[in-house]
């Protein structure tokens, strides 16, 4: 019977972690099995930044220093699995640590929403859909924004309702609007850690329409219609 080296369950192990993770946090783990059933001892090789430690028995990997995404991501180290006893044969795999942005970007509108309008006078309450985004990286799911009106005085005229994690609907509460531009402030919260909030403005014009477009004197561009 020829003694064989331990076998890792994966050629490369990958983990993703926020760059502001607390020291001592488990950032990943590796697993190997020995064909002869011997115990395995795990060790790290090439941890030149001194960021990591591995539990020799379980293969769990922990941070032991502040992680800095500016130093370069992914951070790659080798993981060694060695037989305990026997011939002390070993195998090598890799552990890649991908450092994610902290939640440091407030939500904002995903597009330029200038040019929104309703034809005046409104024959029935109207609504429009808008989309929010931020510049953070989102793991397992997309952003999960919540939406509300930016000031209490708007609540007589407008309401905002969430459609999904990135889209919401702005609706008029009545039809008695003047023929002018209204600036509607929307508060968008990202629900992150820490939660960040952005207040954005949606300019909405109530205007006389010609063939479904906002009538403007010569030299003005037509606005985009939403209902």
């Amino acid at each position: 019977d020829v003694n064989e080296a331990p076998q890792f369950s994966q050629h490369v192990f990958q983990a993703k972690v926020s760059e502001d993770v607390a020291i001592g946090t488990k950032v990943g783990n590796v697993t190997a099995k020995d064909p002869e059933g011997l115990d395995i001892s795990y060790s790290l090789r090439g941890d030149t930044r001194g960021w990591l430690k591995i539990d020799h028995v379980t293969g769990e990997i922990f941070s032991v220093a502040p992680l800095d995404r500016e130093a370069g991501s992914p951070y790659r180290v080798q993981v060694v699995a060695t037989e305990v006893g026997g011939s002390s044969l070993s195998s090598v795999s890799e552990f890649h640590l991908i450092l994610m942005d902290v939640n440091d970007n407030p939500p904002r509108l995903a597009k330029d929403y200038t040019g929104l309008f309703f034809c005046h006078p409104l024959s029935a309450p109207g609504s429009l859909i808008f989309e929010a985004t931020d510049d953070d990286q989102h793991l397992f799911r997309g952003p999960h924004f919540t939406f509300s009106l930016g000031s209490g005085s708007l609540q007589n005229d407008w309401e905002v309702s969430k459609i999904n994690g990135t889209h919401a609907r702005l609706s008029t509460r009545h039809t008695e609007f003047e023929e002018r531009e209204y600036v509607v402030l929307i508060r968008i919260n990202d629900g992150g850690r820490p939660p960040l909030e952005g207040i954005v403005s949606l300019p909405v014009t109530f205007c006389s329409c010609v063939e479904g477009s906002c009538f403007r004197p010569a030299g003005h561009k037509h606005h985009h219609h939403h209902h």
Partner: antibody, heavy 119, light 113 residues
Framework: QVQLVQSGAEVKKPGASVKVSCKAS????????MNWVRQAPGQGLEWMGA????????NYNQKFKGRVTMTVDTSTSTVYMELSSLRSEDTAVYFC????????????WGQGTLVTVSS | DIVMTQSPDSLAVSLGERATINCKSS????????????LAWYQQKPGQSPKPLIY???TRESGVPDRFSGSGSGTDFTLTISSLQAEDVAVYYC?????????FGGGTKVEIK
């Protein structure tokens, strides 16, 4: 064998958005990153970003942050790339490219999707 | 971001002769953690998608003819076509896959003299 099949050519007006799809087959979809690379006419290659289908983690090139959104539908093994606020400089061929085994070079490429931005 | 600089921009070589393309990185691409160089080479023929030739600076993709070889370490890398064939006329790109964001060289056009 690995195949990446992209959606067809698009013509868009400035300010609009475009959404390109890339359907993968021939491998375990969630085991490999998917990248998006673009190439303007007569120009070189530019990496836009990547998504890991296993957890939907995205990593975007800072140049495109705020304009690009990459999503994945694991039920159909399809990755999507949406680029908003289009301008004429975004006229390019957009490629999806699967990551390599155990690292991040581009081992397999889609056929490319031409996006033309013109008023 | 890591800047990749290729030279020359274009290259005309006789059939059967050696073609050499250089790629210089603004940062060291040799990982002290794994002792690998994270550099790849691609070939792109007119109207086609790029095709991977080399990764980890010197490992050939399966199916790539052995006349293509990659060498170098750290910041200086070379793609060599030992005996140029007609079908090798293309643009060649280097790419670093060491740190996000992944970046490409500007490309080298190889033609037949």
């Amino acid at each position: 064998q690995v195949q990446l099949v992209q959606s067809g050519a698009e013509v868009k007006k400035p300010g609009a958005s475009v959404k390109v799809s890339c359907k993968a087959s021939g491998y375990t979809f969630t085991d490999y990153w998917m990248n998006w690379v673009r190439q303007a006419p007569g120009q070189g290659l530019e990496w836009m970003g990547a998504i890991d289908p296993s957890d939907r983690y995205t990593n975007y090139n800072q140049k495109f942050k705020g304009r690009v959104t990459m999503t994945v539908d694991t039920s159909t093994s399809t990755v999507y790339m949406e680029l908003s606020s289009l301008r004429s400089e975004d006229t390019a061929v957009y490629f999806c490219a699967r990551g390599g085994y155990g690292d991040y070079w581009f081992a397999n490429w889609g056929q490319g999707t031409l996006v033309t931005v013109s008023s | 971001d890591i800047v990749m600089t290729q030279s020359p921009d274009s290259l005309a070589v006789s059939l059967g002769e050696r073609a050499t393309i250089n790629c210089k990185s603004s940062q060291n691409l040799l990982s002290s953690g794994t002792q690998k160089n994270y550099l790849a080479w691609y070939q792109q023929k007119p109207g086609q998608s790029p095709k991977p030739l080399i990764y980890f600076a010197s490992t050939r993709e399966s199916g790539v003819p052995d006349r293509f070889s990659g060498s170098g370490s750290g910041t200086d890398f070379t793609l060599t076509i030992s005996s140029l064939q007609a079908e090798d006329v293309a643009v060649y790109y280097c790419q670093q896959h060491h740190y996000f964001p992944w970046t490409f060289g500007g490309g080298t056009k190889v033609e037949i003299k």
